[in-house]
């Protein structure tokens, strides 16, 4: 299987939402030996390999933030990880994972990872993941809502938070 | 809260098998990763037995294949260990656990653990 | 198997002070640029209880004194500074390869 980033680059306004997305697609296997470990972390670029540094996001670790259930099942982080930090991460039944920051400041800009392992019985595992950039603006330069800029094309896009 | 709790007999005598079961409460054994048998030696040492998959399949310590069952009854929650053809070496305290995934595999759960004493 | 070696057996170390112990595997427990090596601690009557796992994360819930490192086949678990209630048996336990296997353990005491 793999994993895609809709947007490469995202930037935003401080103080608005904005929710990053990646989907798993390709072949999956929907047995009942499959799992699927889903999560979302910060990194930094300039290393050998993108996404191999794996830092919090607003002090929450990568398993603070996980997801973890069976194929394509539905599933989201407790809701007080959203109240007390401001993030959600969730998935649906089509394969898209997202985390969603509430209220951005600059200190939020930076690289941020979506990883899906696909762990098989007995505890063999298969990695992927996404990488996209965060910018948040602040003055008379900043959008006047999050533009998202798609991996594939240099054509924009406006995008709020749900 | 997720809560494992081992039961099953004080006293085996030798040759005979050795029987427990592990009742799970706050979590389904169909909904995680793999569920545990580990026992612990008189002397401290720790032994990982084997474990049972949310989908029922298994895997065994290799020390111990021949001797070895995990099963499972998921209207009850429970996962159980058969121990065959035990000697006095197989007195121990017998735990099982939960396994998690976090870039490591770890028992993040375990059950306060039952003592049994292989003895004629 | 994988042998996991402890050392020391044992230490005493005072209040206040750093606990370092050691765990040496035969061969290395890493993949994928992480360490699959835990540590648990033990105290008398109680199962073990998870500290950290991945060689470095903190479970949750577990006070930040106690810190993990190291990669390949050397890793250490640190305990500073130790309080009284630190008193315990310390394990380290690797899960890269079937069978998953544990060090012999490092008795704590606290002078």
């Known amino acids: 299987f793999k994993v895609a980033t809709l947007y490469s680059l995202y930037v935003c306004p401080e103080g608005q939402n904005v929710t990053l997305t990646c989907r798993f697609f390709g072949p999956v296997d929907k047995g009942h030996d499959v799992t699927f470990y889903k999560t979302w972390y910060r990194s930094s670029r300039g290393e050998v390999q993108t996404c191999s540094e794996r830092r919090p996001i607003r002090n929450l670790t990568f398993q603070d933030l996980h997801l973890h259930h069976g194929g394509h099942q539905a599933a989201n982080t407790s809701h007080d990880l959203a109240q007390r930090h401001g993030l959600e991460s969730a998935s649906d039944h089509h394969g898209n994972f997202s985390i969603t920051m509430r209220n951005l400041t600059l200190l939020d800009s930076g690289l941020y990872c979506c990883l899906v392992v696909e762990i098989r019985h007995h505890h063999s595992e298969h990695r992927v993941h996404g990488a996209m950039e965060l910018q948040v603006q602040t003055g008379k330069d900043a959008p006047s809502s999050c533009v998202a800029y798609p991996s594939s094309s240099q054509e924009s896009e406006n995008i709020t938070a749900a | 809260d997720v809560q494992l709790q081992e039961s099953g007999p004080d006293l085996v005598k030798p040759s005979q098998s050795l029987s427990l079961t592990c009742t799970v409460t706050?979590?389904?054994?169909?909904?995680?990763?793999?569920w545990h048998w580990i026992r612990q030696f008189p002397g401290n040492k720790l032994e990982w037995m084997g474990d049972?998959?949310?989908?029922?399949?298994?895997n065994y310590n290799p020390s111990l294949k021949s001797r070895i069952s995990i099963t499972r009854d998921t209207s009850k929650n429970q996962f159980f260990l058969q121990l065959n053809s035990v000697t006095t070496e197989d007195t121990a305290t017998y735990y099982c656990?939960?396994?998690?995934?976090?870039?490591?595999?770890?028992?993040?759960?375990w059950g306060a653990g039952t003592t049994v004493t292989v003895s004629s | 198997d994988i042998v996991l070696t402890q050392s020391p057996a044992s230490l005493a170390v005072s209040l206040g002070q750093r606990a370092t112990i050691s765990c040496k595997a035969s061969?290395?427990?890493?993949?994928?640029?992480?360490?699959?090596m835990n540590w648990y601690q033990q105290k008398p009557g109680q199962p073990p209880k998870l500290l950290i796992y991945?060689?470095?994360n903190l479970e949750s819930g577990i006070p930040a004194r106690f810190s993990g490192s190291g990669s390949g086949r050397d890793f250490t678990l640190n305990i500073h500074p130790v309080e009284e209630e630190d008193a315990a048996t310390y394990y380290c336990?690797?899960?890269?390869?079937?069978?998953?296997?544990f060090g012999g353990g490092t008795k704590l005491e606290i002078k």
């Open positions: 656990a939960r396994d998690y995934y976090g870039f490591s595999w770890y028992f993040d759960v």
């Open positions: 706050g979590y389904s054994i169909t909904g995680g990763y793999n």
């Open positions: 049972i998959h949310k989908s029922g399949s298994t």
């Open positions: 061969q290395s427990v890493d993949y994928d640029g992480d360490s699959y």
């Open positions: 991945g060689a470095s």
């Open positions: 336990q690797q899960s890269i390869e079937d069978p998953w296997t």
